[in-house]
Interface confidence: low
């Protein structure tokens, strides 16, 4: 009869018992170590800035439109301004500059100020274009949208961007954008290398 509480038979050679006795604390130790390591790694990750993990992201709100003959929209971002931020990319004179190569999700919404569907259609064409405006060698349009009969346009796309690319958002036409933060915003999010 086996002894109570033992996994080993007295008559059998005790190799299994020894192995099991050694293995249980070893596995338990490994599990504990793994749990501790994961926790510490997670804490370390939380302390690291997002950009150092490759998760470059920015969400911006409209600051102002350009002076005469300048169709660009000028953006601003930062915790003091509410729900806008920059982690990785930076603003250069109101234009967004990329700091890490990769494929990005670019998104934008622009609402025209003091606008109705009749105003929008009567003063067509009002268009919004997002593109790489510098360096000149990489200049290209990434998104082009027309307001047609609406007062708001929104779009997004995945596109490769490189360190140093500056994104410009050009609003052409006679209507001005709303500066309300829930109506006009622009952002990028790094997705993969």
């Amino acid at each position: 009869m086996p002894e109570e509480g033992s996994g080993c038979s007295v008559r059998r050679r005790p190799y299994g018992c020894v192995l099991r006795a050694a293995l249980v604390p070893l596995v338990a130790g490994l599990v504990i170590c793994l749990v501790v390591c994961i926790q510490r790694f997670a804490q370390a990750q939380q302390q690291l800035p997002l950009e150092s993990l490759g998760w470059d992201v920015a969400e911006l709100q409209l600051n102002h439109t350009g002076p005469q003959q300048d169709p660009r929209l000028y953006w601003q971002g930062g915790p003091a301004l509410g729900r806008s931020f920059l982690h990785g990319p930076e603003l250069d004179k109101g234009q967004l500059r990329i700091h890490r190569d990769g494929i990005y999700m670019v998104h934008i919404q622009v609402t025209l100020a003091i606008c109705s569907s009749t105003t929008a259609s009567r003063h067509h064409p009002t268009t919004l274009a997002v593109g790489i405006c510098s360096p000149a060698s990489r200049s290209i349009s990434l998104l082009r949208l027309s307001f047609h009969q609406g007062c708001t346009i929104a779009s997004q796309r995945l596109t490769p961007l490189a360190r140093g690319d500056t994104l410009c958002t050009n609003l052409t036409g006679t209507l001005l954008p709303s500066r309300n933060t829930d109506e006009t915003f622009f952002g990028v999010q790094w997705v993969r290398p």
């Epitope: 002076p67 003091i114 003063h123 006679t174 001005l176 709303s178 309300n180």
Partner: antibody, heavy 118, light 107 residues
Framework: QVQLQESGPGLVKPSQTLSLTCTVS??????????WSWIRQHPGKGLEWIGY???????YHNPSLKSRVTISVDTSKNQFSLRLSSVTAADTAVYYC??????????WGRGTLVTVSS | DIQMTQSPSSLSASVGDRVTITCRAS??????LAWYQQKPGKVPKLLIY???TLHSGVPSRFSGSGSGTDFTLTISSLQPEDVATYYC?????????FGQGTKVEIK
Amino acid sequence: QVQLQESGPGLVKPSQTLSLTCTVSGGSISSDGYYWSWIRQHPGKGLEWIGYMYYSGITYHNPSLKSRVTISVDTSKNQFSLRLSSVTAADTAVYYCARDFGWYFDLWGRGTLVTVSS
Amino acid sequence: DIQMTQSPSSLSASVGDRVTITCRASQGISNYLAWYQQKPGKVPKLLIYAASTLHSGVPSRFSGSGSGTDFTLTISSLQPEDVATYYCQKYNSAPRTFGQGTKVEIK
């Protein structure tokens, strides 16, 4: 240097239409980015925005004035105009034209007093 | 519509005093606020826009602060030429509206 100058009759009879013109000198009314506004100030009181226009013909007026307001532009004369219909004594005010950089007013005319009285 | 309320409606201070005028919006307007100065018998002049940016040519004794619903115009050292009525104006959306004004006098 851009300057604005209001002109029009200083006295208007009740129920008639008030008509004012703002002449822009030293710059073009067609300059991109600038809207052109009318603002008024009742005697001894605060400022009230009436409405704006853009050289292309876009206009917007303060809903508090209902549909009494018409703002128009004459780019050939570098002028824009205000018409306020069915006036009453409550429309007696100093009327200013102002340059509007989309949002705030960075340049004002000297103002013209319009009295509504029979 | 968003209402703009200024306080006090008038104040009297000595030359060299620090003067503070407040403007409160009935709803949040981010930093989309301008301040104007109107001297007696004169035209209003833009002092500050974007809540804290001094318009060109405005003396540095004027400063603005605030965001959301509460804003402040400060004159760090009151001068005789600062006697005027000061107005705030919100411009985040139409209609543009002004505060009722704060009259500043010298004691």
